[in-house]
């Protein structure tokens, strides 16, 4: 068929909950390409009808929900003007009741369901929720040993659980839970995460580098919407938290009631030697009280700020 096989990806998944896989392989998928999903070498593509339990949504294959019989190899075919590439995804579905201790241990879970916290440090766990734009995710709840996590050492920030002053007792089995809404229907997503601890620094004591901002001011009109990215480079297995703060408080907490200023979801691009992280801050409406206040981007021990200022009056208008 003239298609070049790129790689095989193995995913081990829990039945009875949504799952999605995005067919991306930069730089191939960054150009003008068409993406088509197939199951088990079938010639018939996966349905694109959004009411179907299994359907293709743009470049994604979406299972609403995953069922035990969905195990198998799925192919994603990426066709360009002069090229054809194929990615194989081997899905293994298992029945797991996270809080049923009578059931044996978990299968060999993929790496994002195994995470490490660093003893004595402020660290975080990430709830990996990869879904297309058509899926709306509600707030995330976190559990340890089947009990909802509460306490001043723990803060939920977007898809992360921040853990301050990690102790040996923080190791064990965690789960993050969110409600996913798609076409008016609601589904529960529950990811189990096995969390181990280490004393090792892990990133060799490297200091993250904030590329932007650079401790500068930004001219912005009163009442406008403003989005500012914080771009950070760091080593691949760093344990640094990246966030926006104002008056030494997380912006999401500081503006908890009005939600006028919010931190965005962190994204990252992986390079050979490092990762480039981006986390933005959104001002839905710039108010007078925002001017002159340093909004700080934090990345581990590194910080950089922006200060909003009113544009200089344009006297030519008079």
């Amino acid at each position: 068929d003239g298609c070049k096989d790129i790689f095989m990806k193995n995913e081990i998944l829990s039945a009875s909950q949504p799952f999605a896989f995005n067919c991306t392989f930069p730089p191939i998928t960054s150009g003008e390409v068409s993406v088509t999903w197939y199951k088990n070498s079938s010639k018939i593509p996966v349905s694109k009808i959004i009411q179907s339990r299994i359907h293709q949504d743009e470049t994604w294959i979406l299972f609403l929900p995953m069922e035990w019989g969905d195990s198998g190899v799925y192919q994603c075919v990426i066709k360009g003007r002069d090229s054809c590439h194929r990615i194989h995804v081997n899905l293994t579905v298992f029945e797991k009741h996270w809080c049923d201790t009578s059931i044996g241990g978990l299968p060999n879970l993929s790496d994002e369901y195994k995470q490490i916290l660093h003893l004595g440090k402020d660290d975080s766990l990430t709830c990996h929720l990869h879904f297309p734009k058509s899926c709306v995710l509600g707030p995330i709840k976190w559990y340890k040993d089947c009990n909802e996590i509460k306490g001043e050492r723990f803060t939920v920030l977007e898809t992360r659980l921040l853990v301050s002053n990690v102790s040996a007792e923080d190791r064990g089995n965690y789960a993050c839970q969110a409600i996913l809404t798609h076409s008016g229907k609601q589904y529960e997503v529950l990811n189990g995460i096995t969390v181990s601890i280490t004393e090792r620094a892990g990133y060799g004591g490297s200091v993250p580098k904030i590329i932007y901002p650079k401790n500068h001011s930004i001219e912005v009109q009163l009442g406008t919407t403003l989005i500012v990215d914080c771009n950070v480079t760091d080593t691949k297995d760093n344990t640094n938290l990246r966030c926006w703060r104002v008056n030494n408080t997380l912006v999401d907490d500081y503006y908890d009631e009005s939600k006028r200023i919010r931190e965005g979801v962190e994204t990252h691009v992986s390079f050979r030697e490092h990762n480039l992280y981006t986390v933005n801050i959104t001002f839905l409406e710039v108010k007078m009280e925002d001017y002159g206040l340093p909004f700080m981007c934090h990345a581990g021990v590194s910080t950089a700020y922006i200060i909003l200022q009113l544009p200089a009056p344009d006297f030519r208008a008079y």
Epitope: N108, D111, K114, I116, L119, G120, A168, R171, G172, T194, V195, S196, I197, T198, E199, R200, A201, G202, Y203, G204, T235, K236, D237
Partner: antibody, heavy 120, light 106 residues
């Protein structure tokens, strides 16, 4: 059950390179920390270094200019290279990993050890 | 570098005797790990996070300590306990082992 199987020569000539392989079954080397330790004659243990889940390497500063730890995730193997060996590098070399009771630093799983003699 | 000094270097005990071996650190250590090494075998994790016994380790063993002073105790020595015991720290790099305590049974 995690198992570590070591392979490599037991005799290396001075100034040459010592190369050892640790083949892992029952776990993926893309999670956790994968260590090398050696035991000198007379029972003196030295921690040599590790390669982490992301490929980050840590080396004992006493070996830094001579040691290299690499991996092949497709084979689920990791490797130790020690260049310019001398008779002082004669030891039993072990690969080991932790993760016991969710503690990465508790080195519970060990290879069988490779006794390496440096001699001409 | 954190130096771990184990004492005594060699100790001899009679069956049923209580023995304690010490591991002193040159700087504060958060947790101590202990390994048992017998001739011709690979080291075995014996005690982790200062006081937790690894799987298969008899309950007569215990670990304790904090800061710079740690110890491993056997409440009633048995013949199979004859081995060399090493302490190790991961608190500060370079990660180091103690010189070992060799336990002999009279």
């Amino acid at each position: 059950e995690v198992q570590l199987q070591q392979s490599g020569p037991s005799l290396v000539k001075p100034s040459q390179t010592l190369s050892l392989t640790c083949s892992v079954t029952g776990a993926s080397i893309t999670s956790g920390y994968w260590n090398w330790i050696r035991n000198f004659p007379g029972n003196k243990l030295e921690y040599m270094g590790y390669i982490s889940y992301s490929g980050y390497t840590y080396y004992n500063p006493s070996l830094k200019s001579r040691i290299s730890i690499t991996r092949d995730t497709s084979k689920n193997q990791y490797y130790l290279q020690l260049i310019s060996v001398t008779t002082e590098d004669t030891a039993t070399y072990y690969c080991a990993t932790g993760g016991y009771d969710y503690v990465e630093d508790a080195l519970y799983y060990w290879g069988q050890g490779t006794s390496v003699t440096v001699s001409s | 570098e954190i130096l771990l000094t184990q004492s005594p270097a060699i100790m001899s005990a009679t069956l049923g005797e209580k023995v304690t071996m010490s591991c002193r650190a040159s700087s504060n250590v958060r947790y101590m790990y202990w390994y048992q090494l017998k001739s011709g075998a690979s080291p075995k994790l014996w005690i982790y996070l200062t006081s937790n016994l690894a799987s298969g380790v008899p309950a007569r063993f215990s670990g304790s300590g904090s800061g710079t002073s740690y110890s491993l105790t056997i409440s009633s020595v048995e013949a199979e306990d004859a081995a060399t015991y090493f302490c190790q720290q991961f608190t500060t790099s370079p990660y180091t082992f103690g010189g070992g305590t060799k336990l002999e049974i009279k």
